[in-house]
């Protein structure tokens, strides 16, 4: 039985050239964690693998950076990064447990002068 | 196996420099960070930094920012910890670690002693 | 930096007993919290990751919990090999931070 549950950043904002870590926590369970892949809506970022270690997508190797820890850090946000994020936490014997973050990101002014969301 | 081997001991004088080495064996050695403790006799454990292999990418603890440089040969999978204007403060065992965030596998520490 | 607050300082038990180590972050981790061990001259050892996490090769007696800020470390009937240092480390933000450490002496 999954017992397990997936606590993320939830909604969160950035500036536009700025930077984000994106970060997920799975609770409740003893299963033991084989691997984490990071997607943006349909897309592949990463995957950090318990014995493999990190790998990152090709595509998003300049502007995706491991870490920290189980993490994702986001840098030279733009516009086009707004958008849907998944952590998707293979476990064993539990299965795959699945965390969303909204990511928004803003023009500079937008950001300083009120976000919608607030970066925890 | 997994192995990180570092040298057992540095003898350098007040205001050298030391360039101490990790040495990884028995993983893909751009797929995981490399971290530095310190560790003072009869003291804790204190993060130095971290550095991937796989971009050269570096974190460092900012007390350790004007002291510490984290660098890299990819070709010999060995990471190197530089450390700079020593003092007796510096007398420590240096350790590398390999981790996710966690840091799983240990070098046996180098030992610095600061002396003149 | 987030700051990690062990406790105790020291403990003494005889083998057998149950003891638990106390981990309080000054902020929420999640459960990005491990636990080391630490012999007298040697190099740490993983015991726990991601909070509760086991590691292959550390005996079942040990044990982690918590979320948040409150993490603990239990030694489920301890045996005089486990007289060590044991630190708790963060890794939800850099720089990554170390606890203070507790002394498990055995009696």
């Known amino acids: 039985m999954m017992t397990g549950t997936i606590e993320t950043t939830g909604n969160i904002s950035a500036e536009k050239g700025g930077s984000i870590i994106l970060q997920c926590h799975l609770s409740s369970t003893t299963a033991q964690v084989t691997q984490v892949n990071w997607e943006q809506q349909d897309q592949l970022l990463a995957i950090c693998n318990a014995d493999l270690g990190w790998h990152i997508s090709p595509s998003f190797k300049d502007r995706v950076a491991p870490g920290p820890g189980l993490g994702l850090t986001l840098q030279s946000l733009t516009v086009n990064d707004t958008g849907e994020y998944f952590c998707i936490y293979h476990t064993y014997p539990d299965g795959t447990y699945t965390g969303r973050i909204f990511l928004e990101v803003l023009e500079s002014s937008v950001a300083e002068h009120g976000a919608r969301f607030q970066i925890p | 196996q997994v192995q990180l081997q570092q040298p057992g001991a540095e003898l350098v004088k007040p205001g050298a420099s030391v360039k101490m080495s990790c040495k990884a064996s028995?993983?893909?050695?751009?797929?995981?960070?490399i971290n530095w403790v310190k560790q003072r006799p009869g003291q804790g454990l204190e993060w130095i930094g971290d550095?991937?292999?796989?971009?050269?990418?570096?974190n460092y603890n900012g007390k350790f920012n004007n002291k510490a440089t984290l660098t890299l040969d990819t070709s010999s999978s060995t990471a190197y910890m530089q450390l700079s204007s020593l003092t007796s403060e510096d007398s420590a065992v240096y350790y590398c670690?390999?981790?996710?965030?966690?840091?799983?596998?240990w070098g046996a520490g180098t030992t610095v002693t600061v002396s003149s | 930096d987030i700051l990690l607050t062990q406790s105790p300082a020291i403990l003494s038990v005889s083998p057998g007993e149950r003891v638990s180590f106390s981990c309080r972050a000054s902020?929420?981790?999640?459960?990005?919290i491990q636990w080391y061990q630490q012999r007298t001259n040697g190099s740490p050892r993983l015991l726990i990751k991601?909070?509760?996490e086991s590691i292959s090769g550390i005996p079942s007696r040990f044990s982690g919990s918590g979320s948040g800020t409150d993490f603990t470390l239990s030694i489920n009937s301890v045996e005089s090999e486990d007289s060590a240092d044991y630190y708790c480390?963060?890794?939800?933000?850099?720089?990554?931070?170390f606890g203070g450490g507790s002394k498990l002496e055995i009696k």
């Open positions: 991601y909070g509760f």
């Open positions: 670690s390999r981790g996710l965030g966690y840091f799983d596998v």
């Open positions: 480390q963060q890794s939800y933000r850099w720089p990554y931070t």
């Open positions: 902020q929420s981790v999640g459960t990005s």
């Open positions: 550095i991937f292999p796989g971009r050269g990418i570096t």
């Open positions: 028995g993983y893909t050695f751009t797929t995981f960070w």
